[in-house]
Amino acid sequence: LPRWRQQWSGSGTTSRFPETVLARCVKYTEVHPEMRHVDCQSVWDAFKGAFISKYPCNITEEDYQPLVKLGTQTVPCNKTLLWSRIKDLAHQFTQVQRDMFTLEDMLLGYLADDLTWCGEFNTFEINYQSCPDWRKDCSNNPVSVFWKTVSRRFAETACGVVHVMLNGSRSKIFDKNSTFGSVEVHNLQPEKVQALEAWVIHGGREDSRDLCQDPTIKELESIISKRNIRFFCKNIYRPDKFLQCVKNPEDSSCLSGI
């Protein structure tokens, strides 16, 4: 008889999850020489150990520490790019500007990007049927806790001038409840981070508003300034330029600025 399985509101674990994580790890370590020492089987074991056999609404940041330790990586100063509600464009940017890095350009972020996973209490099985939804079920689920953990670490290790890409088409350009607003902003280290520069990306072709004057940006400026980090904001009006460069990655002048 099939075991009774908890029904959650969210979609289940991504199919072929273990194989995907392992394959991504191998690919990443092949492409990034500085991570060649990483043993991908150990990485998978640590990843699995964070959520397998555990009640999926009771996951802690502590559960992910062995994985975080294995995936330790540093970004050069001035090269960290955070983002909020504009992931695809941020990734297009770092695809071209290869010396800047989002969390998903780092090993752990790369492994988990766009994946869902959870297990069940007291069984070694992965739940492919359903996983807890952050709103409807619980916030301490395996996926949410993972991103909170690695986002915190990513922000803590940033140094120099940190950039953040924000979506100017949203009603809340800066959202205190986003991962950026609730985790990363509060974990930038004032002794290491000189400044946060926000890039507000405009959507409309004819848009010529100054979105750096938006009340939510003023709120972000206030939070950052209180943490003794300087704040700058720039309006960015032509996001289609990112894709034009991505389409022609062989064009070295796209990569270097000019």
Partner: antibody, heavy 120, light 107 residues
Framework: QVQLVESGGGLVQPGGSLRLSCAAS????????MNWVRQAPGKGLEWVSG????????YYADSVKGRFTISRDNSKNTLYLQMNSLRAEDTAVYYC?????????????WGQGTLVTVSS | DIELTQPPSVSVAPGQTARISCSGD??????VYWYQQKPGQAPVLVIY???KRPSGIPERFSGSNSGNTATLTISGTQAEDEADYYC??????????FGGGTKVEIK
Amino acid sequence: QVQLVESGGGLVQPGGSLRLSCAASGFTFSSYYMNWVRQAPGKGLEWVSGISGDPSNTYYADSVKGRFTISRDNSKNTLYLQMNSLRAEDTAVYYCARDLPLVYTGFAYWGQGTLVTVSS
Amino acid sequence: DIELTQPPSVSVAPGQTARISCSGDNLRHYYVYWYQQKPGQAPVLVIYGDSKRPSGIPERFSGSNSGNTATLTISGTQAEDEADYYCQTYTGGASLVFGGGTKVEIK
């Protein structure tokens, strides 16, 4: 290396038309916004028009809107400016300029310019 | 539309520092670009993104942008720096604007 060479300038009567061309080489033409910037004799720089790489987006300064048309042929690596209903105040050296990539909107490279004189 | 205001001329002794200002409403919210133009020649980009120097531009050229004013600084000016300098910004849509230009004279 990047090269931009303008052509098509000359003397034209008020109300007349002229088509400027800019031949580009040394970079992937379709990756970049391209622009026309002009400079009247003894005056400063004035942006005239810009076009995206694909080329779905075009932009015009108010002073030329409805009279000038920017276009490009990516297969020929060539930028164009069709100028109609020309006025004396359109007299200037017209420069073709390549935009900077990504978050920057300035001009990395300029041609040597072509002179347009509108006079009767 | 933003309007960029530059002083018509700046005079400086050789080896001294020349500072050219460019002012406009909330200019700090926009990237600023600086061009050098010598008589009979096309403009040359000397600073982009407020403070970045293109390859081939001497280190004596630097830029900053805060409040309502962007500044181009030429440290240890040389005779070859005598030229017109233009600031430029982009504020979306069809609002790409240049300042009126500043003539730098080496005394």
